[in-house]
């Protein structure tokens, strides 16, 4: 069928709660493309009816909720004008007690389930909640060993638990819980996080280093498509978020209507002492309003920008 196969890493998920996976593979999904989800090489696409427990929601596949029998390989087919890519995602579902956050024995757990706090520092844990816009998430509650976390050292800020003056006793099994509302129905989302404590400042200290961009301008013709990578080195155990912003707003939110400028999916390469992260920004069509505006790459406390400028006229 001429589609190029791309295999994603396994996702390990908890039964009886919502789960969503977004089919994005930049730069493939940055232009005019159609996305269709399938299960286990079935010829029949996943339903787009929002009342279905499993359905496609724009580029997402959404499980409301995930069930034991949903394990398997899912494919999303991305068709462009001149291209076709088939992305394979292996989903493994496991049973979990409500407060049971000790999931370290499972193979290939993603970094979302294993996080690190730095001893003596003010640090944070992140509750990774990836859902389409049709899902509304309520405030997040945090637990440790099945009990609610409280105390002056702990502050809940959006999807993060801020921990001031991290101590060795902050290691252990945490869970973050949120209520998700979709089409008037409510579901509970509970993510387990195994937390360890490190004294290491790690590679280049604990502040992420933005390799590119370097606060510079880029010459680009009006109307062209442009993709710019933000390359960041950071410790292997970091909990920093990396993103692109404009006017202090996430680009995906700022251009929510037109979707003309989008942030790509983050990738990373592991080295012995650190990770190299890449997250791109795609301008589907550069417009006049984009020139002179700083587009900021953020990585934890570090920032760097690019400014688009029109090429100088060629008088030859």
């Amino acid at each position: 069928d001429g589609c190029k196969d791309i295999f994603m890493k396994n996702e390990i998920l908890s039964a009886s709660q919502p789960f969503a996976f977004n089919c994005t593979f930049p730069p493939i999904t940055s232009g005019e493309v159609s996305v269709t989800w399938y299960k286990n090489s079935s010829k029949i696409p996943v339903s787009k009816i929002i009342q279905s427990r499993i359905h496609q929601d724009e580029t997402w596949i959404l499980f409301l909720p995930m069930e034991w029998g949903d394990s398997g390989v899912y494919q999303c087919v991305i068709k462009g004008r001149d291209s076709c890519h088939r992305i394979h995602v292996n989903l493994t579902v496991f049973e979990k007690h409500w407060c049971d956050t000790s999931i370290g024995g499972l193979p290939n757990l993603s970094d979302e389930y294993k996080q690190i706090l730095h001893l003596g520092k003010d640090d944070s844990l992140t509750c990774h909640l990836h859902f389409p816009k049709s899902c509304v998430l309520g405030p997040i509650k945090w637990y440790k060993d099945c009990n609610e976390i409280k105390g002056e050292r702990f502050t809940v800020l959006e999807t993060r638990l801020l921990v001031s003056n991290v101590s060795a006793e902050d290691r252990g099994n945490y869970a973050c819980q949120a209520i998700l509302t979709h089409s008037g129905k409510q579901y509970e989302v509970l993510n387990g996080i195994t937390v360890s404590i490190t004294e290491r400042a790690g590679y280049g200290g604990s502040v992420p280093k933005i390799i590119y961009p370097k606060n510079h301008s880029i010459e680009v013709q009006l109307g062209t498509t442009l993709i710019v990578d933000c390359n960041v080195t950071d410790t292997k155990d970091n909990t920093n978020l990396r993103c692109w912003r404009v006017n202090n707003t996430l680009v995906d939110d700022y251009y929510d209507e037109s979707k003309r400028i989008r942030e790509g999916v983050e990738t990373h390469v592991s080295f012995r002492e650190h990770n190299l992260y890449t997250v791109n920004i795609t301008f589907l069509e550069v417009k006049m309003e984009d020139y002179g505006l700083p587009f900021m790459c953020h990585a934890g406390v570090s920032t760097a920008y690019i400014i688009l400028q029109l090429p100088a006229p060629d008088f030859r």
Epitope: C99, S102, D145, G151, E169, G172
Partner: antibody, heavy 116, light 107 residues
């Protein structure tokens, strides 16, 4: 180093109440739950209840309602268990155990003897 | 309340022997289970946290595992100081409950 200090023994008259203390050092007292557990002579361990020093939220084993009261003194980093009108049934060793992670650290225990 | 059934209640074994103690939970507790050791003077020490995580300073001969609702503490090679009492403790839901205990005796 984390330490939970308890007195070795308390003698109490029947019908009088007794207050057991557990002084904490080595961690942020107001950040984690504190448990109380007892053990009658030759018996196993039994959970009495727990308290969070930050806001004094208490969860008590139904079996000890009306018998046990949990309190804290944040300034002294000390947790207390008060036993009201103890009888020979309350003759036991009482342990405090902190849940920095679940029941991570234990006090040495206080032996409560009820005697006229 | 969740009932924790611990077996055996007593066990005679020799130095260097491998032994396993078991606790069965009457309801789902996930991995929210600890193993505790109680010395003759009454001192209690946690050995295993969250079913299988070994506490710092605890010898590697101790290990914890789970099969369904059965939880095991295994001592791979008994040392003289291991002949004491052991308890399991579930902290999945209150009231938290303990197993009845196992007295490990030297043969």
């Amino acid at each position: 180093e984390v330490q939970l200090q308890q007195l070795g023994a308390e003698l109490v008259r029947p019908g009088a109440s007794v207050m057991l203390s557990c002084k904490v050092s080595g961690y942020f007292f107001t950040s984690y739950w504190m448990n109380w557990v007892n053990q009658r002579p030759g018996q196993g361990l039994e959970w009495i209840g727990m308290i969070h020093p930050y806001d004094s939220e208490t969860r008590l084993n139904q079996k000890f309602k009306g018998k046990a009261t949990l309190t804290v003194d944040k300034s002294a980093s000390t947790a207390y268990l008060q036993l009201s009108s103890p009888t020979s049934e309350e003759y036991a060793v009482y342990y405090c155990a902190s849940s920095t992670t679940a029941f991570a650290y234990w006090g040495q225990g206080t032996l409560v003897t009820v005697s006229a | 309340d969740i009932l924790m059934t611990q077996s055996p209640s007593s066990l005679s074994a020799s130095l260097g022997e491998r032994v396993s103690l078991t606790c069965r939970a009457s309801q789902d507790i996930g991995n929210a289970l600890n193993w505790l050791q109680q010395a003759p003077d009454g001192t209690i020490k946690r050995l295993i946290y969250a079913t299988s995580s070994l506490d710092p300073g605890v010898p590697k001969r101790f290990s914890g595992s789970r099969s369904g609702s059965d939880y095991s503490l295994t001592i791979s090679s008994l040392a003289s100081e291991d002949f004491v009492y052991y308890y399991c403790l579930q902290y999945a839901s209150s009231p938290y409950t303990f197993g009845g205990g196992t007295k490990l005796e030297i043969k």
